[in-house]
């Protein structure tokens, strides 16, 4: 009789352990579902905001032809400015023509007035040649007006309607550029 009772007790204990395990699994599963749900919601929100914002340029960016421009509201040195642009999927501004220069300077006049803005132009320390960040040469009319007397690396910036040069370690605003999204319609 005693043996029978102890066998039943052991079976009950085993059942209890199994139920606890099942409960634990269920709790884990529930937590996993909640995480999955969060994941899906975040993904949907990101996707929807991307889909909803199917304009050629992101919010707070200015469009001109095939390009989108972002005028920073913070100062940074040239290299940090480049990093900030890359994080936005863009690079520092690369001015290809006088028309683009006119658009930029006109826009800056409307937005902020006469400040200094880094662009993606730097001077090779060895050859002294000015090059855009993609390795191309600026057109003759788009070379910085003054040669900086700095012994350090020299970078280009826009002020009013001029391209100028300065020590890359000075702090300025900056302008990022990315390609505008083409409409699929």
């Amino acid at each position: 009789k005693l043996l029978q009772v102890s066998t039943i007790a052991m079976q009950q204990q085993e059942k209890l352990i199994q139920q606890e395990r099942a409960l634990l699994n269920f709790t884990e599963w529930k937590r996993s579902c909640a995480l999955q749900m969060k994941y899906c919601q975040a993904f949907m929100q990101n996707s929807l905001s991307s889909a909803h914002n199917s304009s050629p340029c992101p919010n707070n960016w200015i469009q001109n032809r095939e390009s989108c421009y972002y005028v920073s509201e913070i100062w940074s040195i040239w290299h940090t400015s480049q990093e900030n642009c890359l994080k936005e999927g863009s690079t520092l501004l690369q001015i290809e023509s006088k028309e683009e220069m006119d658009f930029i300077t006109g826009s800056l006049r409307k937005i902020k007035g006469s400040y200094d803005y880094w662009v993606g132009l730097s001077q090779d320390g060895h050859s002294g040649r000015w090059l855009w960040q993609d390795g191309s040469s600026p057109s003759p009319g788009l070379l910085p007006a003054e040669r900086s007397q700095s012994a350090n690396q020299v970078c280009g910036y826009v002020k009013s309607n001029s391209l100028l040069s300065s020590n890359c370690s000075t702090w300025k605003y900056f302008i990022c550029e990315k390609y505008a999204l083409r409409s699929s319609v």
């Epitope: 994941y39 990101n46 890359l86 994080k87 999927g89 690079t91 960040q133 993609d134 990315k178 390609y179």
Partner: nanobody, 121 residues
């Protein structure tokens, strides 16, 4: 979390070529830019070359005309073709991805382990 798998480093003679490649995997919403940085002992990491998801490119002055960066957006892979290598290109080269995490709205930096490039005769 983004994992970056680099390959292609090694020892090469001056004037020689190497091709680095780096693939991003893991969970992320999107990658805004990928690129290569290098770091010599005791120095800060500096950008060598980067390419955005839209195809815009940036190089550091010392590699312009010698290195070419390219990407395959579908494979989340970036390549760095290094030609006319010089002894001063010797460094550890780190792959970088500027990716927006699943739960985030701004891009964060993710780094590979680094691959050694040695240019020596």
């Amino acid at each position: 979390q983004v994992q970056l798998q680099e390959s292609g480093g090694g020892l090469v003679q001056p004037g020689g070529s190497l091709r680095l490649s780096c693939t991003a995997s893991g969970s992320f919403f999107s990658i805004n830019a990928m690129g290569w940085y290098r770091q010599a002992p005791g120095n800060q990491r500096e950008l060598v070359a980067a390419i955005t998801n839209g195809g815009r490119i940036a190089y550091t002055d010392s590699v312009k005309g010698r290195f070419t960066i390219s990407n395959d957006n579908a494979k989340n892979t970036v390549y760095l073709q290094m030609n006319s290598l010089k002894p001063e290109d010797t460094d550890v080269y780190y792959c970088n991805a500027k990716a927006i995490p699943i739960y985030g709205s701004t891009a964060e930096d993710y780094w590979g382990q680094g691959t050694q490039v040695t240019v020596s005769s």
